[in-house]
């Protein structure tokens, strides 16, 4: 059979093979960070010869190059320095604007490794027009110097650069231009996933159930797309598994798109999923009109069931019929719903496109996207109502004009991205989004990204200061109340003196607030069985306080999910009629779960919650420990079934001002809480004044430790007693 | 509601295997953390619990009939099935399937099968 | 032993209180549940826990536990209580469960 010569390294980086050395195997070369390849790829024809896409030569020396970023062509009123024809990687270039103008954007901008200028382009602008001075961005030309309303500005790129976003804009009546900032790029440059996942995520996470965000921060680049929690969104997932994609990358496609499913599950809106896997022919795997597309689990499943060798028979790339097989679902949901009702004008579309190349059969796809922008009315008042991704992954063959011309350009957004490689694509896909900078009460929301604060990940995370040094801890299940510990309270009832500790962006200690009432369980006596032998009991040991003024929603202060109400019943995607039956069937279904607290320093500790028959062996223990239970007869009476137990294999132990913290569990992207911490056997923060210093019980502890958590499916009557009219309670 | 329904021969004869299969409808047999028990009662006598199986896969059985008893769980059809080998004329019984609910120190079960009599006869 | 004990037969008067008991050494460790059984019917959960009745079962059952003893009362009983009572427990060990032998009440 025939094969391709072996005679293709590249200096100084590496290549992998698609399908080996057999004919239509595509070789990709890679360079280290700061360098790109030069030819990207070879394809090894069925004669047994490589052919370089574009080269006019048959066989050159595949070489690595160092990486430039784009010179400016023009800059308005100001200077740049230094004066370069382009930049090396590291390179700077400042700006300065002239009398009379102010500088916005970055005064100094530094060339990325990728080919990319770091920060945002640089205007000098005196605010003279309707529309402020749109700029222009490096490596950019731009006819058109007027900013009244209806007046246009055209970019081109110089030399061989290639242009993203809006080649014409147009100065809207809102003052704000249409279309999205044109960008030149170098053919090889690709973007960093910590670009793409906040640009993405920014265009989404409106989509998907939030309200305006407090402030349009430099993470948060845009209009966020407004879906009333009534309201409904398709989202079309097209998966490209032409030849060119090996099969360990459509893997890593489908994982991307189950991460993205998964995540969009998440949130409070109705939304349907259409998967379509496209080479020669598109394969449409789950379609919007198939009431299964609504249910998380059948969409993963259709996803898992996508198989790489569903195309082996037409091995192109037909991005036309893959986008037209999106229309035709479109058309058919149109004549179901009939085109002037209001259930068909609600429903926004979202459709991202994840290839490795550009399409090489069946017609220009732009074709079908104009089809679908028609049928969907999208106009200037129906902007909203369409988004296109357009994806592009591994630099060899993508086509940055296609990519572009399919994706949707809206001001202050970007719908086009070339990614190094698939697992890049894996990176943006698990944090693109970030609902955690919603501004409205939506419960359970942790920010989960690596690089997050500790306050981001868990802002319903309260500290509670008494009258008495010991600290304790709470969580807040709405803006205005805290749930904690009883114990934390029993020192008198003076609570003008106590402070509640909320997380707040705007500095890294807090924000404190007055209680303007305390609710402490009437059943908690914790002398209550002393002449039991029981020197200290927590039954009943929960209260909440009402805080004095109403905490404003943000990455740092956000309520958890009470489980057994309408709010975690949304987060959990249960059905309307579920219980609270349903919610602990759902939330503690295991025999062990894994569970987190906070710790004094911040950081999620695990632990395991022992449900069932392995709650009491996790329990029993307690009959050994003397001091606190000197005459103890019956271990029941200590440990009854108000608590969850937890301590036993690797678990940490709460310190103890650690007390009335929230023991919750992630489900679906969002956190609940199912318990807070009340007592145990073993105090690991004793003896230390350092909070970041826990010592583990040594193995041979008699004891061995144990913590006991009140179980909030336990206290549901007190809870809707005193939150009936807060949060909306499920019946039991 | 939570329902439970015993299906199976009624009658099986002496050394053979009894087979029988509780099927559960108005809730998942995989949700929450239930032990999903078998209990006989010959003609005239008390319960005798046979055993539990929880949907992680732990069993739990009767020591005295231990060695014949096997409980298996079928998650994909929400049933659980029970098999007792080598059965005699003393496993004459009205055979119950029921949940088991093991909460604090207790343990009880809260919704039983309406029971199927299996007589077994040489 | 990991035996539940049971007198087998009782008698209550109509409206009378009525306390059915239920020895073994497991009821130290763990508390019995409750069951009643009709004729031909299948048994119904009437009590559990330390004293906890199930929804939809009147408030005239309750139950209590004392050393290694466990009582189902019914506090004035009617003729529709007459049945069979069955307590349970995990035993001793905690890994297996048992039933006592049942107690018949009748309604006099």
């Known amino acids: 059979a025939t094969s391709c010569p072996q005679n293709v390294n590249i200096s100084g980086g590496t290549f992998t093979l698609s399908h080996g050395w057999a004919p239509g195997s595509l070789l990709i070369y890679s360079c280290p960070q700061g360098l790109y390849p030069s030819p990207a790829s070879r394809l090894c024809k069925s004669s047994g010869q490589w052919q370089t896409p574009r080269a006019t030569r048959s066989l050159t020396k595949a070489v690595c190059k160092p990486v430039r970023c784009p010179a400016p062509v023009s800059f308005e009123n100001g200077i740049y320095t230094p004066r370069l024809g382009s930049y090396p990687v590291g390179g700077n270039v400042s700006f300065e604007c002239e009398d009379g103008f102010i500088l916005r954007g970055s005064p100094v901008r530094q060339c990325r490794p990728n080919g990319m200028w770091d920060g945002e382009t640089a205007v000098c602008d005196n605010g003279a027009g309707h529309c402020p001075n749109p700029g222009i961005s490096l490596g950019a030309v731009r006819t058109g110097s007027r900013f009244g309303h209806g007046d246009k500005v055209r970019y081109r790129c110089s030399s061989n650069l290639v242009l993203t976003g809006s080649a014409e804009r147009e100065c809207q009546g809102n003052g704000v231009w249409s279309g999205t900032e044109p960008i030149c790029r170098q053919p090889y440059s690709y973007d960093f996933p910590e670009d793409v996942a906040p640009a993405l995520g920014t265009s989404f996470s409106h989509m998907l159930g939030a309200t305006n965000p407090t402030q349009r921060t430099k993470e948060s680049l845009g209009r966020k797309i407004q879906i009333q929690r009534s309201g409904h969104l398709n989202l079309y997932l097209l998966l490209d598994s032409s030849q060119s994609v090996s099969e360990n990358d459509f893997l890593i496609f489908k994982e991307s798109a189950s991460l993205m499913v998964d995540r969009i599950f998440s949130f409070e809106i109705n939304v349907s999923v259409a998967i379509i896997t496209f080479a020669s022919e598109p394969k449409v795997l789950m379609s919007v009109l198939n009431v299964n597309s609504r249910d998380i689990t059948e969409v993963i499943s259709s996803l898992e069931n996508a198989k790489y060798k569903d195309h082996e028979n037409g091995t192109g790339t037909n991005t036309y019929a893959a986008l037209n097989s999106v229309y035709l679902m479109m058309n058919n949901q149109m004549q179901l719903l009939g085109m002037k009702t209001m259930a068909w004008q609600e429903i926004r579309h979202a459709i991202i496109l994840l290839t490795d190349g550009k399409s090489n059969m069946g017609g220009s796809p732009k074709t079908a996207v104009d089809q679908i922008r028609e049928i969907l009315n999208i106009n200037q008042k129906r902007n909203d109502y369409l988004d296109i991704y357009a994806i592009g992954v591994g630099k060899l063959d993508v086509d940055w004009r296609e990519l572009n011309e399919l994706g949707s350009k809206k001001d202050g957004e970007r719908h086009a991205f070339i990614l190094q490689d698939t697992k890049a694509l894996h990176q943006v896909f698990e944090h693109m989004l970030d609902v955690s900078k919603l501004t409205d009460t939506i419960c359970g929301v942790g920010n989960m990204s690596a690089n997050a604060s500790d306050q981001e990940r868990t802002p319903w995370h309260v500290t509670i200061k008494p009258k008495s040094q010991e600290t304790c801890r709470g969580a807040l299940i709405s803006d205005q109340w805290v749930l904690t510990a009883a114990h934390c309270f029993r020192d008198g009832n003076d609570h003008s003196l106590w402070r509640v500790n909320v997380g707040d962006p705007k500095s890294q200690w807090g924000k404190e607030f007055l209680i303007e009432k305390a609710v402490i369980s009437p059943g908690f006596d914790v002398f209550a069985k002393k002449n039991q032998g029981i020197l200290e009991f927590y039954g009943d040991d929960i209260a909440l306080l009402k805080l004095a003024q109403k905490v404003k929603m943000s990455t740092h202060a956000r309520p958890i999910c009470l489980p057994c109400t309408m709010e975690a019943n949304l987060a959990l995607r249960r059905p309307q009629g579920s219980t609270c039956r349903d919610h602990e069937n759902e939330l503690l279904n295991k025999q062990s779960v894994p569970a987190h607290f906070v710790a004094l320093n911040g950081s999620k500790l695990n632990i395991n919650l022992k449900m069932g028959v392995e709650w009491t062996s996790c329990a029993e223990v307690v009959s050994q420990e003397k001091t606190m239970f000197p005459n103890l007869t019956d271990v029941r009476e200590v440990v009854t079934d108000q608590f969850l137990c937890s301590g036993t294999q690797e678990d940490e132990s709460p310190c103890k001002g650690e007390s009335g913290g929230a023991v919750f569990l992630e489900r679906r992207f969002r956190f609940f809480q199912v318990g807070l911490v009340s007592w145990g056997l073993y105090n690991p923060c004793l003896g230390s004044a350092d909070k970041n210093s826990r010592k583990r019980a040594p193995r041979s502890k008699v004891p061995p430790p144990r913590d006991f958590h009140i179980n909030l499916f336990r206290m549901q009557p007190w809870l809707r007693q005193h939150l009936g009219d807060v949060l909306n309670f499920l019946p039991l | 509601q939570l329902q439970l329904q015993e299906s199976g021969p009624g009658l099986v004869k002496t050394s053979e295997t009894l087979s029988l299969t509780c099927t559960v409808s108005?809730?998942?047999?995989?949700?929450?953390?239930?032990?999903w028990g078998w209990i006989r009662q010959p003609p005239g006598k008390g319960l005798e619990w046979i055993g539990s199986?929880?949907?992680?896969?732990?069993?739990y059985n009767n020591p005295s009939l231990k060695s014949r008893v096997t409980i298996f769980i079928d998650t994909s059809k929400n049933q659980f099935s029970l098999k007792l080998s080598s059965v005699t004329a003393a496993d004459t019984a009205v055979y119950y399937c029921?949940?088991?609910?093991?909460?604090?120190?207790?343990?009880?079960?809260?919704?039983w099968g309406q029971g199927t009599l299996v007589t077994v006869s040489s | 032993s990991s035996e539940l004990t049971q007198d087998p037969a009782v008698s209550v008067a109509l409206g009378q209180t009525v306390r059915i008991t239920c020895q073994g050494d497991?009821?130290?460790?763990?508390?019995a549940s409750w069951y009643q059984q009709k004729p031909g019917q299948a048994p119904v959960l009437v009590g559990y826990?330390?004293?906890n009745r199930p929804s939809g079962i009147p408030d005239r059952f309750s139950g209590s536990t004392s050393g290694n003893a466990a009582s189902l009362t019914i506090t004035g009983s009617q003729a529709e209580d007459e049945a069979d009572y069955y307590c349970?427990?995990?035993?001793?060990?905690?890994?297996?469960?048992?039933f006592g032998g049942g107690t018949k009440l009748t309604v006099l």
């Open positions: 349970n427990s995990r035993d001793s060990s905690g890994d297996h469960l048992i």
């Open positions: 029921a949940e088991g609910v093991s909460s604090g120190w207790s343990y009880y079960f809260d919704y």
């Open positions: 199986i929880y949907h992680g896969g732990n069993t």
């Open positions: 826990g330390k004293n």
């Open positions: 497991s009821l130290r460790r763990f508390y």
């Open positions: 108005g809730g998942s047999i995989t949700s929450g953390v239930y032990y």
